[in-house]
């Protein structure tokens, strides 16, 4: 059986939309599937790599690599999107390409970044972990770390940094899929909202879905002990 909830929820474009949340009800009247997984049920994607989920994550990453920061022209906010999802008239799509990106580092002025920009994250304004020396962030935003400390400045002068961020990674469903969404939408969908991250590639949704002990390698499920727990 399915339980359907409909509600007006604030979405990425800053407008309220009617959203449906469909929950698979437990046939035996008990915990939801998410809760059962958290309690240690035999759920194979938590035990070993699931090809379907792996493909989903790779597809999400490929899309994210090509994303940019969509900044609303009315200063109402910004969100990481694909160019096609960013209004040409009402917003500015900040995306580095060709020769428009910043240099990889102050020591290598010739090599430009082509992957980015990312809303609220920039190698030029992140103090921790700083992109310098032997630890220059790669020219692939899906390999960027979470910035734990921004440079202390109210304004940076960068469109994608000085905007009010409207969406962050949200882990939704037992498949461990990730979407950049508003907190409100994420909570309505019973997802896990990552306040600390800017990109889906920085979070490991399956690790969150599975719960219990974190995977040794967040990319590789290793909860073999589930076979005995349940």
């Amino acid at each position: 059986a399915q339980h359907v909830t409909t509600q007006l929820v604030l979405r990425n474009k800053g407008v309220y939309e009617s959203v449906k949340y469909i929950q698979q009800e437990n046939f035996w009247i008990g915990p939801s599937s998410i809760d059962l997984i958290h309690l240690g049920a035999k759920f194979s994607p938590c035990i070993r790599k699931d090809q379907q989920i792996e493909q989903l994550v790779l597809r999400e990453r490929d899309l994210e690599r090509d994303s940019g920061c969509c900044v609303q022209n009315d200063h109402s906010g910004c969100i990481q999107t694909q160019r096609k999802d960013c209004s040409e008239t009402l917003a500015t799509f900040v995306k580095w390409q060709d020769d428009t990106g910043p240099p990889m580092d102050k020591s290598d002025l010739g090599q430009k970044r082509t992957s980015g920009a990312v809303c609220h994250q920039d190698p030029r304004t992140c103090e921790e972990p700083a992109s310098s020396g032997a630890h220059i962030w790669p020219d692939d935003i899906t390999k960027w770390p979470i910035c734990t400390e921004q440079a202390k400045s109210n304004r940076t002068g960068f469109l994608h940094m000085d905007c009010q961020i409207k969406g962050r990674p949200c882990c939704i469903s037992t498949k461990g899929s990730c979407e950049i969404t508003t907190r409100e939408y994420c909570e309505f969908m019973h997802g896990y909202f990552h306040e600390e991250a800017t990109l889906c590639s920085q979070v490991h949704c399956l690790d969150k879905v599975c719960g219990l002990l974190p995977f040794l390698n967040p990319e590789v499920p290793d909860q073999f002990y589930r076979l005995w727990l349940s």
């Epitope: 020769d99 010739g110 030029r124 940076t156």
Partner: antibody, heavy 123, light 106 residues
Framework: QVTLKESGPGILQPSQTLSLTCSFS??????????VGWIRQPSGKGLEWLAH???????YYNSALKSRLTISKATSKNQVFLKIANVDTADTATYYC???????????????WGTGTTVTVSS | QVVLTQSPALMSASPGEKVTMTCSAG?????MYWYQQKPGSSPRVLIY???NLASGVPARFTGSGSGTSYSLTISRMEAEDAATYYC?????????FGAGTKLELK
């Protein structure tokens, strides 16, 4: 308000070492992304970049003069120093220090300049 | 090193006249920076990242260009614009400036 002020010996003889000080206020060189550079301008001529130093102590020099230049900083005193060894009459110029930042810029730029100090090398 | 050639070296314009000066790079650069220097004063930044107006700079100044060809335009010359203008690149070390364009008031 950001200000920079250069000071130097005014006059010195060939083969001596020129020591310049840039004292600044309104910003700190401990601030992430900040830098201070030195640029000189012989009278009636164009600008020549000499060197710059970053908040993280990385230093960059003009390769044509690198063997003679040394840049350093005293972060707590808000000062940057430039030494030019073995000066020659060709080093006679006005020396400027300038703040470097990348506020809103894909690269960096000299966004605030000092008033300059005139240095004459003469025997 | 990237050689920047500015032209003309000297020009004059009447108040209200449109002024355009160019900066040609010996090899391709991503962005150009423009500085204004009045006699007896230190330089000040006018344009950064080719076309962005620095804080406090009048809107009559515009920068444009790409690759090896860049220009600075003053839409309507004013007496206070009489100065020497320098272009500068931050694309590769050593950082280089053009020799300057001296703009005089007619």
């Amino acid at each position: 308000q950001v200000t920079l002020k250069e000071s130097g010996p005014g006059i010195l003889q060939p083969s001596q070492t020129l020591s310049l000080t840039c004292s600044f206020s309104g910003f700190s060189l401990s601030t992430f992304g900040m830098g201070v550079g030195w640029i000189r301008q012989p009278s009636g001529k164009g600008l020549e970049w000499l060197a710059h130093i970053w908040w993280d102590d990385e230093k960059y020099y003009n390769s044509a003069l690198k063997s003679r230049l040394t840049i350093s900083k005293a972060t707590s005193k808000n000062q940057v120093f430039l030494k030019i060894a073995n000066v020659d009459t060709a080093d006679t110029a006005t020396y400027y220090c300038a703040r470097i930042s990348n506020y809103g810029s894909n690269y960096w730029y000299f966004n605030v300049w000092g008033t300059g100090t005139t240095v004459t090398v003469s025997s | 090193q990237v050689v920047l050639t500015q032209s003309p070296a000297l020009m004059s314009a009447s108040p209200g006249e449109k002024v355009t000066m160019t900066c040609s790079a010996g090899s391709s650069v991503s962005y150009m920076y423009w500085y204004q220097q009045k006699p007896g004063s230190s330089p000040r930044v006018l344009i950064y990242d080719t076309s962005n107006l620095a804080s406090g700079v009048p809107a009559r100044f515009t920068g444009s260009g790409s690759g090896t060809s860049y220009s600075l335009t003053i839409s309507r010359m004013e007496a206070e614009d009489a100065a020497t203008y320098y272009c500068q690149q931050w694309n590769s070390y050593p950082l280089t400036f053009g020799a300057g364009t001296k703009l005089e008031l007619k």
